[in-house]
């Protein structure tokens, strides 16, 4: 039903030529370019090299960009399912790099890698029951969404299923884990003596990523785990169901994949790419896979399950959705149905199947071997029609508008890759393993990555995450593009998004948050130190206290979704075009590296502040096993002068010397490189960033010194103390050195 | 135009078998439950059998239990009773409905809202 491609399919084989050919004409024309590209950099000034002119700006590009173009484009990828592994999706990848060359970009591959995805059986559904005392199901969950009106004849829509559940037929009574994070448990275990040991769990969706909720609900010893969209978390108050408003219907569910990999990629290639030569673990030792079988259900399937729960009543307000249910805890159903029971039927099989990025270049005209990556995915779980293919079709117009200056005779300073990734919603393969393939040239020539995937999950404000290397640039362009919003006419990005999302910390100035997980800018940020950014319209967090956007991975996520209720004019489209597209244009094409490493001195001191005030919970430990805090606040404040001092030098030195330029760009580039331990985190070897890390506790989340965060967490619990205290205290040590190692790396040289 | 069109009725033998069919056009038929229901002669209306829009949940009213079988086939959009072990009693005019609400999935208890119905096919079992 969703043709799957195996890694058989030989049709993209490329040719190869004799390596002794390419080998001596590398040599030729690597020496003749030496010389080239040597004599060009000292004859040209700066300004000439870039071949900037009032023509071939930043305005330029900003101007090319058509909100038309993004809603023609967006209409084009959603009109069928486009699932990572599926032949719609290949033949997208191809559309994609057709269109890529004619818009003129000076390469575009195709490069395909054998990952383990999971899809559910075609013959046989995945279903939950709940069976009376005889073993008849006397209720089940529904097969499929209602197809939204248009679409029913539309064939491979996925069903809603949670990828990379195992089979599993289990039977039991129920116990509803609110959120099922991990202070759910807490709750649970510690306070109401709830024991999951055995049971089924149902959970709502929302607050964390759904992943990790299965892996808290395997450790408390549940044996499946119910996946359900609370209308407290997925229906805004005074808004309609789709297709009459933007609101959940009740027979909608959210698709999603439930690992836990932790930055693996590919759970059969850790660290490596999925190539034909890839060794390939068993199933047994796959990095990441649920022990337990899990399934997504509608709030109307929900209902049917939580109207008859006994046991507990549930702790407090906290734990209580928007159903017309009880919200008891459980275990098992109430008085008259209590001899009732929950079966899950669970078929979905995972398959080693073949999938494609899509990589266009442009080349830089100064210096080729520098990088600036924009990126997002082109998998979906059924349309995409915000997921992800709002953000591709931002990152098409952007192509397009790059591609209209290279033709008229233009080129960027520095070489700019776009990259159309492939099983994001898998867990983020198609980013991984090229970037694990790539690794190399990476970390040697990764200036920045730029993420984009959905440009809108509202149409409120702008939200930017990214790291602090890029707080100036992101300011500065915001305070030069014009704001979408009602009421703002005239007025710049920048006051819109202040006024709307203020920082918490500075006055009239907007927030910006940190970098967690959960999309394709992981590999580059939290694996390899590529300085990152994303951006997007969202909603305001104040008045909408649903989780994602209500719609997020059904079937109604549509084009009509977008444009009937979201985004009519696609002028938020436009806005998130123009800052993605301006991020990359300013760090291909600015002589200086636009990152200002004062930044990150500043959130340096304030995380070591945070995560001090929370080891300051257990005073007297820290006294009994001398636990302190000077020596990262030592290197914080040799960061603070040395990052001052080079700001200085940065301004004053002579931008017409290529040596020095470069020499001063490179400690720009290499500073996020810096904060990279090569060991990794704690039973967390692909997340080697040491002041950021996706939480432990929700992958979407970021965590600031998150080798000291988990060290502390739940200290109080820990059976030896010592121990305990002592780890504390190695990633205090680990946390100093890196950051006082950061730190020299922006000395001067000499 | 909304329009659903029974058809298969006939007169049949205590104990046979027969197999209604009805054919819905102009709406979504996969996001809508269906309903049967029946009206014997001289009397009242009396649902028969529900089967949800995805066909996973079926419900029967007592006097057909185990003797009648709802099915659905989306991709042809239609609706299908089986009708097997028939009685005198089962004499009625057989009406297919349309749920009223898209994408509901109702429960056995649930009181039934129907807004399209079919012209009807009349099943006679006398002998």
């Known amino acids: 039903m969703w043709n799957l491609l195996h890694e058989t399919d030989s049709a993209v084989a490329t040719a190869r030529r004799p390596r002794w050919l390419c080998a001596g004409a590398l040599v030729l024309a690597g020496g003749f370019f030496l010389l080239g590209f040597l004599f060009g950099w000292f004859i040209k000034s700066s300004s000439e090299a870039t071949n900037i002119t009032p023509k071939h700006n930043m305005k330029a590009f900003l101007d090319e960009l058509k909100a038309e173009n993004i809603k023609k484009f967006l209409h084009n990828f959603t009109q069928i399912p486009h699932l990572a592994g599926t032949e719609q999706n290949f033949q997208l990848a191809k559309q994609i790099q057709s269109q890529w060359k004619e818009f003129g970009l000076d390469s575009v591959e195709l490069t395909h890698y054998d990952v383990l995805l999971s899809y559910p059986n075609k013959t046989h559904p995945n279903y939950i029951s709940i069976i009376n005392e005889d073993g008849n199901e006397i209720f089940n969950t529904s097969l499929f969404e209602p197809p939204p009106a248009g679409y029913e004849n539309v064939s491979d829509i996925v069903p809603p299923f949670s990828a990379f559940s195992p089979q599993g037929m289990p039977e039991g009574d129920l116990v509803y884990v609110n959120y099922a994070r991990t202070e759910d448990f807490f709750k649970l275990e510690r306070d109401m003596k709830i024991n999951c040991s055995g049971k089924i769990v149902i959970a709502r969706y929302g607050k964390v990523f759904r992943g990790n909720k299965v892996k808290n609900a395997q450790l408390a010893g549940a044996t499946g785990v119910i996946l359900y969209s609370d209308p407290a978390d997925y229906f805004a108050p005074g808004v309609k169901s789709y297709p009459d408003g933007w609101n959940l219907p009740g027979g909608g569910v959210q698709r999603g994949n439930i690992l836990n990999l932790n930055g693996a990629g590919d759970p059969l290639t850790p660290g490596y790419p999925a190539n034909e030569y890839a060794y390939r673990r068993g199933i047994a030792e796959a990095v990441g896979l649920p022990s337990i079988p899990v399934h997504p259900i509608g709030y109307y399937d929900a209902q049917k399950l939580l109207e008859k729960m006994g046991g507990s009543a549930s702790p407090d307000s906290s734990w209580r959705g928007s159903l017309k249910v009880p919200y008891n805890v459980g275990p098992g159903f109430t008085g008259n149905f209590s001899t009732q029971k929950v079966k899950m039927h669970i078929h979905s099989t995972s398959e080693v199947t073949r999938i494609y990025n899509v990589i266009g270049t442009l080349r830089g005209a100064v210096e080729p071997d520098r990088y600036v990556i924009l990126g997002g995915h082109r998998d979906s779980w059924v349309f995409g029609g915000i997921d992800p293919q709002s953000g591709a079709a931002v990152v098409h117009e952007i192509v397009r508008s790059f591609g209209t200056l290279k033709k008229e005779g233009w080129r960027p300073r520095r070489t700019i890759l776009f990259a159309s990734w492939d099983a994001e919603e898998f867990g983020l393969l198609g980013s991984t393993e090229w970037a694990e393939e790539n690794s190399r040239l990476l970390q040697e020539r990764g200036v920045a990555y730029i993420n984009a995937d959905s440009s809108i999950e509202g149409n409120y404000t702008l939200r930017v995450d990214c790291t602090p290397l890029m707080y100036s640039l992101v300011y500065n362009l915001t305070k030069e593009l014009e704001s979408p919003d009602e009421g703002f006419e005239g007025k710049s990005l920048y006051e819109s998004w202040t006024k709307k999302s203020p920082s918490p910390e500075f006055s009239g100035m907007p927030r910006i948050s940190k970098l967690g997980s959960g999309n394709d800018f992981e590999v580059f940020f939290q694996r390899l130190g590529i300085a990152s950014g994303r951006a997007r319209y969202t909603k305001n967090w104040e008045t909408n206290k649903f989780s994602s956007y209500p719609l997020y991975h059904s079937v109604y996520e549509t084009y009509e979704l977008v444009e009937k209720f979201y985004d009519p004019m696609f002028k938020y489209h436009l806005t998130v075009a123009q800052v993605r597209g301006g991020m990359v244009f300013e760090l291909a094409n600015s002589v200086v590296l636009p990152f200002d490493c004062r930044d990150y001195a500043v959130v340096l001191r304030k995380y070591a502040d945070k995560i001090y005030n929370i080891s300051m919970k257990h005073p007297q430990e820290m006294k009994t096993y001398s636990v302190s805090f000077d020596s990262l606040f030592s290197a914080v404040k040799n960061f603070t002068e040395i990052a001052s001092k080079f700001s200085e030098r940065l301004r004053d030195f002579d931008k017409s010397n290529p040596i020095l330029l470069r020499m001063m760009n490179d400690q720009l580039m290499f500073l996020e490189r810096a904060f990279i331990d090569p060991l990794g985190l704690p039973d967390r070897p692909f997340y080697r960033h040491v002041i950021y890390a996706p939480s432990s506790h929700n992958k979407y989340a970021g965590e600031s010194f998150p080798g000291i965060y988990d060290a502390l967490f739940d200290i109080e619990s820990k059976v030896d103390p010592s121990q305990a205290w002592g780890e504390v205290k190695r990633q205090i040590s680990i946390a100093t050195f890196t950051v006082q190692a950061a730190a020299e790396t922006l000395s001067e040289v000499a | 135009e909304v329009q659903l069109v029974e058809s298969g009725g006939g007169v049949v033998q205590p104990g046979r078998s027969l197999r209604l069919s009805c054919a819905a056009s102009g709406f979504s038929f996969s996001g809508y439950g269906t309903h049967w229901v029946r009206q014997a002669p001289g009397k009242g209306l009396e649902w028969v059998a529900y089967i949800s829009y995805d066909g996973s949940n079926k419900y029967y009213a007592a006097p057909v239990k185990g003797r009648f079988t709802i099915s659905r086939d989306n991709s042809k959009n239609t609706l299908y009773l089986q009708m097997n072990s028939l009685r005198a009693e089962d004499t009625a005019v057989y009406y297919c409905?349309?749920?009223?609400?898209?994408?509901?999935?109702?429960?056995?208890?649930?009181?039934?809202?129907?807004?399209?119905w079919g012209q009807g096919t009349m099943v006679t079992v006398s002998s």
């Open positions: 409905a349309k749920d009223a609400a898209w994408g509901l999935r109702l429960g056995e208890s649930s009181s039934y809202d129907f807004d399209i």
